[in-house]
């Protein structure tokens, strides 16, 4: 089978600071030197691109300066971190991997990680 399998955790709970991390792992059918990783958010059948990065194998992932994502790669594994999350950002975050170079091109899409974000309770005012 020429398809590329992508694995990611089913559920992740964001920290109280609105940070969520998960691993996206792909079983590469080829010897790719250039890989593109995209995080998609699916909520209420709407799909939006959260962030995307292209990296050379062995190098760091480089997201755009204004991206809410950071990440590191190790072999066929990408460690993704999404920051600045709020309760309204709860949803299914899908890892999409593309082997860009050399040909042939391969596409792999994970089943998604449900990220739950709970806004922290505001600190009660003190009388002191």
């Amino acid at each position: 089978c020429k398809a590329m399998h992508v694995a990611q955790p089913a559920v992740v709970l964001a920290s109280s600071r609105g940070i969520a991390s998960f691993v996206c792992e792909y079983a590469s059918p080829g010897k790719a030197t250039e890989v593109r990783v995209t995080v998609l958010r699916q909520a209420d059948s709407q799909v939006t691109e959260v962030c995307a990065a292209t990296y050379m194998m062995g190098n760091e992932l480089t997201f755009l300066d204004d991206s809410i994502c950071t990440g590191t790669s190790s072999g066929n594994q990408v460690n993704l971190t999404i920051q600045g999350l709020r309760a309204m950002d709860t949803g299914l975050y899908i890892c999409k991997v593309e082997l860009m170079y050399p040909p042939p091109y391969y596409l792999g899409i994970g089943n998604g990680t449900q990220i739950y974000v709970i806004d922290p309770e505001p600190c009660p005012d003190s009388d002191f």
Epitope: K2, P104, I109
Partner: antibody, heavy 118, light 108 residues
Amino acid sequence: QVQLVESGGGVVQPGRSLRLSCAASGFTLSRYGMHWVRQAPGKGLEWVAVTWYDGSNKNYADSVKGRFTISRDNSKNTLYLQMNSLRVEDTAVYYCTRVDWWGAFDFWGQGTLVTVSS
Amino acid sequence: EIVLTQSPGTLSLSPGERATLSCRASQSVSSSYLAWYQQKPGQAPRLLIYGASSRATGIPDRFSGSGSGTDFTLTISRLEPEDFAVYYCQQYGSSPWTFGQGTKVEIK
């Protein structure tokens, strides 16, 4: 709304060149892969070429490799197909199409007819 | 290269009938990367189904897709007059991107 409009088709002699354009609107070109697909008269669909995101990665069908060049100008939201050394068998309607988030081809242009004949 | 073979070549049916179109791959294709398109004369193809079974935006629920591995099916539960067209399957999980040769659904 998303719209793709091809232009540049016409009648050309074998061995000559032609450049097709595809003007995209309603979305940001740099975030999508873009393909050219062709259809010979009365025949099925045949994939021709793709250019990815910033344009640095491209793939071609064996039938056009070395003769056709796909490119994009993201600042102009335009996709191109430079066709050199044209052959009679390149006669077809050429469609540009966008890759959706899942990899399928979700929007297509109306097509432009290229006829290679002596 | 993954070769997709569609059958039958032509399907002659009446409005209201059920249409079952088959697409067979020369090697296993992940169901995530199999699409179906509809094309009417003089028009560009239109995406109907992606991921083997997910309907594209605006596609009526009489269209459904199923299958896995090497065998995929497009079903039109009750043919409407506007459904008579040519249908293509496509794999998009790896290059080169390939299409089936098409199945023509014509009015009986």
